[in-house]
């Protein structure tokens, strides 16, 4: 057992048919000695009496919040939740497994640029009783300094029958250099309630893996004298590091149709334009992606080729 | 020294051309090692992030460009003294900071070549002989070191008497070969740099 | 199985004409992009000029520029080229070839042999 | 226009053994450079897009590297079947080019 914030608190059970189960000791919080009773959740049976209670964690039914009282007034309440292990590996039960970019993947993560500021999802078909906390950090032995915000429903979709909830949340390296070489990775650790059930879930990574640069911007069209080529010209992305000639970015520009299965011109560039061919129905696309750390690709930006 | 004869532009910054060749390198050959050493912890994940040249060369910081100087987290500086010419500086109003960074970077090329040197004689004797360095890697090192023409002394090439524990040297290579791309992704982002200024 | 059958070899004197035809099979003709390119005996290889035979779409080598043309016949699959004011450097093993990627070919039809002779 | 330029022309080659043949263009060209396979009497076969990507049914011994100007095709291992010429394309710009071509001969 272990406290997972004030007067909360997580029992680790080896979850088979039969287990013994964890035995729990609880201390009212209280400098009284004697007529002190306890209760779970809202029963009003009485559990047993004195300043301690013994319990056998097994299921849970033996979980929840626990209360001590004296004389009909509350002294202290202890929240036990359940972390269950099975076949020696912790539960996962709350969040969704998104397989990218591998299996057991529960959270992930992307950075604009190398500002040291990056974000995190994850998702759940679970809507109610639930809720996360975060905490990051550079390195775990010797940890330094990721701020995290809360974490907030940032989408809902329709899957089949089910509903899909996504969360994220916004982290920022207390001190971070754009153009450091990182050596440690960065540490994220999300602690997930849901009802009774606690289950944490890690993911570590460098930043320089995790870029995504945001599309490139204001993209321009100017067509070429008697000819079907086109020049197309764009900015780099507002969010993306500064000075570009540094953090330098190259593209692909693409002109395809509607279906991903018509023909298409494509041609990468270091440059911000280039020339193409424009078909009727088509439109052109450019995408951006470090030039010199082969990260993600941003997402397209696009404009009409009439 | 000459420009190789496909240099795009005769004016170009003379060492961007092999810096650009040395990140190609340098990926090829961590790809081929990834590849070649499956069974061997090799990816980024696996492997601990080791900078040989850390308290040797301050590169990142000497090669800073000046809209982040201002950045606090970015001047975590450390004295040291380098030398102070090189033909990348060629025709070029070049500050102190610009030296010290191109000969930072040379320290590093320096250090870095004479590990792999070492390394290479050691996979050589490899019974399985089942990766070596790329001789092009080696080159393309030599040639960007050319390219900065610094004058320094000759670091010498470590020999070992004791018989080499090859599981050992394969993944010290797998961590000498992830840190060096992170360097060589600095150096060409140094080196775009310097031929955009 | 995609494929590009040419027409028969070719025996030209110089200054005339010469026109290739080129037949699709297998795919929608006009989701691809064609392509000419022809090979001097014992030489390279040297790109001509594509068209797209949804709209009829052209695009030549300027060293070709004006003596090249290339058609498309949709009801046909069939794609052709004529080549004008022969000479005998234009001996060549001409090549139909198409590809969803406008800038490089994945599909190549077997060769047609021009002869240029006087 | 770009011009491309192979070397070398020529490279005799032991089975088994690698080859690597290079590409240069006239220019920066970023990725847009393709690789083709011609055997004697037969239409050219595409080998690699974009530099390094490889195409469905071609055997993993053919790679690509390269950025720029500088280019690479890599045959890990020849097999007698990948005795030919091989040729590099530029698809930076129009015209389209094509390098004069490597042939691969038995040593």
């Known amino acids: 057992i272990w406290e997972l914030k004030k007067d909360v608190y997580v029992v680790e059970l080896d979850w088979y048919p039969d287990a013994p189960g964890e035995m729990v000791v609880l201390t009212c919080d209280t400098p009284e000695e004697d007529g002190i009773t306890w209760t779970l959740d809202q029963s009003s049976e009485v559990l047993g009496s004195g300043k301690t209670l013994t319990i056998q964690v097994k299921e849970f039914g033996d979980a929840g919040q626990y209360t001590c009282h004296k004389g009909g007034e509350v002294l202290s309440h202890s929240l036990l939740l359940l972390h269950k292990k099975e076949d020696g590996i912790w539960s996962t039960d709350i969040l969704k497994d998104q397989k990218e970019p591998k299996n057991k993947t529960f959270l992930r993560c992307e950075a604009k640029n190398y500002s040291g500021r990056f974000t995190c999802w994850w998702l759940t078909t679970i809507s109610t009783d639930l809720t996360f906390s975060v905490k990051s950090s550079r390195g775990s032995s010797d940890p330094q300094g990721v701020t995290c915000g809360a974490a907030t429903l940032s989408a809902e979709r329709v899957r089949g029958d089910n509903k899909e909830y996504e969360y994220s949340v916004e982290c920022q390296e207390d001190s971070a250099c754009p153009a450091a070489e990182e050596s440690l990775p960065i540490e994220v650790m999300v602690d997930a309630v849901h009802k009774l059930k606690y289950e944490n879930y890690t993911s570590s990574f460098f930043i320089r893996d995790i870029i995504k640069p945001d599309p490139p911007k204001n993209l321009q069209l100017k067509p070429l004298k008697n000819s079907r080529q086109v020049e197309v010209s764009w900015e780099y992305p507002d969010t993306w590091s500064t000075p570009h000639s540094y953090f330098s970015l190259t593209f692909c520009v693409q002109v395809q149709g509607k279906s991903k299965r018509e023909k298409k011109d494509r041609v990468f560039t270091d440059k911000t334009s280039a020339t193409v061919i424009c078909r009727k129905n088509a439109s052109i696309s450019v995408r951006a992606q470090d030039r010199y750390y082969s990260s993600s690709w941003s997402e397209w930006a696009s404009v009409p080729c009439s | 020294r000459n420009l190789p004869v496909a240099t795009p532009d005769p004016g170009m910054f003379p060492c961007l051309h092999h810096s650009q060749n040395l990140l190609r390198a340098v990926s090829n050959m961590l790809q081929k090692a990834r590849q070649t050493l499956e069974f061997y912890p090799c990816t980024s994940e696996e492997i601990d992030h080791e900078d040989i040249t850390k308290d040797k060369t301050s590169t990142v910081e000497a090669c800073l460009p000046l809209e982040l100087t201002k950045n606090e987290s970015c001047l975590n500086s450390r004295e040291t003294s380098f030398i102070t010419n090189g033909s990348c500086l060629a025709s070029r109003k070049t500050s102190f900071m610009m030296a010290l960074c191109l000969s930072s970077i040379y320290e590093d090329l320096k250090m870095y070549q004479v590990e792999f040197k070492t390394m290479n004689a050691k996979l050589l004797m490899d019974p399985k002989r089942q990766i070596f360095l790329d001789q092009n890697m080696l080159a393309v090192i030599d040639e960007l070191m050319q390219a900065l023409n610094f004058n320094s002394e000759t670091v010498p090439q470590k020999s070992s008497l004791e018989e080499p524990d090859f599981y050992k040297t394969k993944i010290k290579l797998c961590i000498l070969l992830h840190a060096f791309r992170i360097r060589a992704v600095t150096i060409d982002r140094v080196m775009s740099y310097l031929n955009a200024s | 199985q995609v494929q590009l059958v040419q027409s028969g070899a070719e025996v030209k004197k110089p200054g005339s004409s010469v026109k290739v035809s080129c037949k699709a099979s297998g795919g929608t003709f006009s989701d691809y992009y064609l392509h000419w390119v022809r090979q001097a005996p014992g030489q390279g290889l040297e790109w001509m000029g594509w068209?797209?035979?949804?709209?009829?779409?052209?695009e030549y080598a300027p060293k070709f520029q004006g003596r090249v043309t290339i058609t498309a016949d949709e009801s046909t699959s069939t794609a052709y080229m004529e080549l004008s004011s022969l000479r005998s450097e234009d001996t060549a093993v001409y090549y139909c070839?198409?590809?969803?990627?406008?800038?490089?070919?994945?599909?190549w039809g077997q060769g047609t042999l021009v002869t240029v002779s006087s | 226009d770009i011009v491309m330029t192979q070397s070398p022309l020529s490279l005799p080659v032991t089975p088994g053994e690698p080859a690597s043949i290079s590409c240069r263009a006239s220019?920066?060209?970023?990725?847009?450079l393709h690789w083709y396979q011609q055997k004697p009497g037969q239409q050219p076969r595409l080998l690699i897009a974009?530099?390094?990507q490889s195409i469905s049914g071609v055997p993993s011994r053919f790679s690509g590297s390269g950025s720029g100007t500088d280019f690479t095709l890599t045959i890990s291992s020849l097999q007698p079947e990948d005795f030919a010429t091989y040729y590099c394309q530029q698809s930076n710009s129009f015209p389209l080019t094509f390098g004069q071509g490597t042939k691969v001969e038995i040593k």
């Open positions: 068209i797209d035979p949804e709209n009829g779409d052209t």
């Open positions: 974009f530099a390094s």
């Open positions: 070839a198409r590809n969803k990627e406008l800038r490089y070919i994945d599909v």
């Open positions: 220019q920066s060209i970023s990725i847009n």
